[in-house]
Amino acid sequence: AMDLILINSLPLVSDAETSLTCIASGWRPHEPITIGRDFEALMNQHQDPLEVTQDVTREWAKKVVWKREKASKINGAYFCEGRVRGEAIRIRTMKMRQQASFLPATLTMTVDKGDNVNISFKKVLIKEEDAVIYKNGSFIHSVPRHEVPDILEVHLPHAQPQDAGVYSARYIGGNLFTSAFTRLIVRRCEAQKWGPECNHLCTACMNNGVCHEDTGECICPPGFMGRTCEKACELHTFGRTCKERCSGQEGCKSYVFCLPDPYGCSCATGWKGLQCNEACHPGFYGPDCKLRCSCNNGEMCDRFQGCLCSPGWQGLQCEREGIPRMTPKIVDLPDHIEVNSGKFNPICKASGWPLPTNEEMTLVKPDGTVLHPKDFNHTDHFSVAIFTIHRILPPDSGVWVCSVNTVAGMVEKPFNISVKVLPKPLNAPNVIDTGHNFAVINISSEPYFGDGPIKSKKLLYKPVNHYEAWQHIQVTNEIVTLNYLEPRTEYELCVQLVRRGEGGEGHPGPVRRFTTASIGLPPPRGLNLLPKSQTTLNLTWQPIFPSSEDDFYVEVERRSVQKSDQQNIKVPGNLTSVLLNNLHPREQYVVRARVNTKAQGEWSEDLTAWTLSDILPPQPENIKISNITHSSAVISWTILDGYSISSITIRYKVQGKNEDQHVDVKIKNATITQYQLKGLEPETAYQVDIFAENNIGSSNPAFSHELVTLPESQAPADLGGGKMLL
């Protein structure tokens, strides 16, 4: 919650210096605090702009100081405004001449809706003039000169919210300069009620705290704190958590504290009077000395804190037995914490009695967001709240506040968090040298993006296309050798920088790829794989001339595509072929070879071949006759793999002619899948057959195809293959 306090010192202006100080206590406003003249309350006041300065004694405070010679320009109404997360809080106050003809009983007066109210002004100067009363600068009432009493009153038998405003009194011949001001604040609700429709019940706001009609929360007077304002602050302190201090020799003497409506203005506890410069009489305490001590067991009454209970007693009147409450204290929290961006688990530790519960401990971010503990534990003397921020980023840097609010009081401790950007190299590492099992790398760790100093560096590496985790080595120098690599393997490399602190590992930098050198001999050259029979394939290669004296041999690996059998054959190095036998007919095999010495050589590329067929080939499929002209036509087809088809025969004859009058066209390259028949007669019907041949024989066509050539002048036609059963 926003804690905004306006200190009016002094509201009655004489020839002394006077000031307004606006303090944002325990939070960081999004926009600057503003202090201005409240023309809503008084339209016809002085127009001069205010000279607002930063209060050097406090981090988030603004101040206006009037020197004695400016006294004539001070009279009027003022405001202070603070904003956080869209919420604006405005506090109002007034200043008037000490030499005014009348003086108000109080600077502000807070009443409940429906209350019977008397707004009173004390006559200070006697004049033979009518007295006049204004509300918000507009005339409302006058008293004839001979009837002006010592106490001039405005009576409101049933105060309503519209009655609220700044009431001023003066003689008719006076002006703003001789006017006395008091502000009436009318709570929108009746006593003890709050809510938009005023039908909720307030909690008790002790020590003259005021129940806020919109939220039901207590606004505590200066010098008291907690949910019900029951807890007295330490001497001369104020604010929601009592962490602001009055720096005067006599504490908060001569400070008028103004808080958000409906509180208004009052002296700090222990003081009374319009100038807050009168101490409470014995037996009285609190703001404006309005509270009476009724200490149960004859305990002493302190004008600042009320009853000072004996050990073992507590409560406003020391009416309850129990361990005396102890204001919580936040411990072991450094003033400055450096954090690496990412996950962050801040800890807030507090003592006090009763010990704070997890609900009573919060963490407030610089933007005003309130965080609650993710984890909580306590010992005999301390409560420890652990918060979790899943992703803290540099914009989260600033003043964070650990806040503890128990029945024994409230305490806040601001601390500074500086969020660092994790380092990341800008460049990929460079490969200086490689062998078949090592690489020399320049890690290129600088320049890097992000924050230093760098605590350690890691070189990460892994083979490309392998689903294994990255391996890493810690490095201290810029040049590093990677050992125990696989030969002829492509690797990727990157560098990760680590800065100090938890979670200091930065993102890995750009990736560099490299391939290790080969090991062993290259594969045989001129490899050729051909079928020999239904159960054998023949692999041949060019003679091998080794560069060293080492013994060598050729290793041939063959595996079936259809079945899961594999065989590796060793062939003496002086041979240039090997017959792969005991194979299955009509099966496809994959074969590769390498030349091995003591070290294994590199594998060749895969070669594939089918063994010869043990059955007649199937008919060519997808037979189409197209591009028909008067003398030619294109025939296309497809054949099935694996039947050792060596040739295709196209047989055609004029329809109706004898069987022996056909023409055979033999296509010996089985990879050809179309052929153009030429020299045909125009306007003639042909019967076309197509066969496939392999080592066993020819395929059996189920039907013939009909082809009719066009007349000489016509354009080509497509024929989907008119089928004629044989």
């Epitope: 869209g86 919420e87 003890q192 809510g195 938009p196 429709e197 039908n199 909720h200 019940l201 307030c202 909690t203 008790a204 002790m206 919109d214 939220t215 039901g216 929360e217 949910r227 019900t228 029951e230 409560g315 309850r320 009763p354 029945v407």
Partner: antibody, heavy 117, light 113 residues
Framework: QVQLVQSGGGVVQPGRSLRLSCAAS????????MHWVRQAPGKGLEWVAV????????YYADSVKGRFTISRDNSKNMLQLQMNRLRSEDTAVYYC??????????WGQGTVITVSS | DIQMTQSPDSLAVSLGERATINCKSS????????????LAWYQQKPGQPPNLLMY???TRESGVPDRFSGSGSGTDFTLTISSLQAEDVAVYYC?????????FGQGTRLEIK
């Protein structure tokens, strides 16, 4: 933080009376308004009554007005609900609760009231 | 009295998935003077009293995990659990406190699919 411990539940015949109690410890009981809320078996939550911190103001749900009385004894840190002329529809788990603004922050453990002949 | 209506009556969501519960009031619970929505959310597990999760429609109560979030304004509100955990199985209630008597929604039963 207030802790609330309830007592006084049981089985009662229609038309009879019963008194529920809620004992508070921890924070200053006398500073807080107090509520009663009930929950019929397998049903949702229904607000019953509220009393101001000093006992001066009391409000009731229409369904219990004239039959139930909320009271408190701040010297004993005790909240009570006197239930007269009980009906079968008053069968429920009854909870006492302290508010945080208008939300109910701290709840008693609940006490079961069964109105049955 | 202000009526509160929740939807759906029951909901089954896989662990780790997002769960969304809706609440509609018969009149606006947004107070224009302070721009606050007078709405709270509760979680109730079997055999236990309700537990306050949210107030002012979107302010998380102390100790409530940040996977719970509240949104909406005026008459339409949503409670979202960003990544459902086993311990989130419960009945969830919305409640208005704009006007007395305070009133609750009928509840939404949340289960694991």
């Amino acid at each position: 933080q207030v802790q609330l411990v309830q007592s006084g539940g049981g089985v009662v015949q229609p038309g009879r009376s019963l008194r529920l109690s809620c004992a508070a410890s921890g924070a200053t009981f006398s500073n807080y308004a107090m509520h009663w809320v009930r929950q019929a078996p397998g049903k949702g939550l229904e607000w019953v009554a509220v009393i101001s911190y000093d006992g001066e103001n009391k409000y009731y749900a229409d369904s219990v007005k004239g039959r139930f009385t909320i009271s408190r004894d701040n010297s004993k840190n005790m909240l009570q609900l006197q239930m007269n002329r009980l009906r079968s529809e008053d069968t429920a788990v009854y909870y006492c609760a302290t508010p945080k603004g208008g939300a109910l922050e701290i709840w008693g453990q609940g006490t079961v009231i069964t109105v049955s002949s | 009295d202000i009526q509160m209506t929740q939807s759906p009556d029951s909901l089954a969501v896989s662990l780790g998935e997002r769960a969304t519960i809706n609440c509609k009031s018969s009149q606006s619970v947004l107070y224009s003077s302070n721009n606050k929505n007078y709405l709270a959310w509760y979680q109730q597990k079997p055999g236990q009293p309700p537990n306050l999760l949210m107030y002012w429609a979107s302010t998380r109560e102390s100790g409530v995990p940040d996977r719970f979030s509240g949104s909406g304004s005026g008459t339409d509100f949503t409670l979202t659990i960003s990544s459902l955990q086993a311990e989130d199985v419960a009945v969830y209630y919305c409640q208005q406190y704009y006007s007395a008597p305070i009133t609750f929604g009928q509840g939404t039963r949340l289960e694991i699919k």
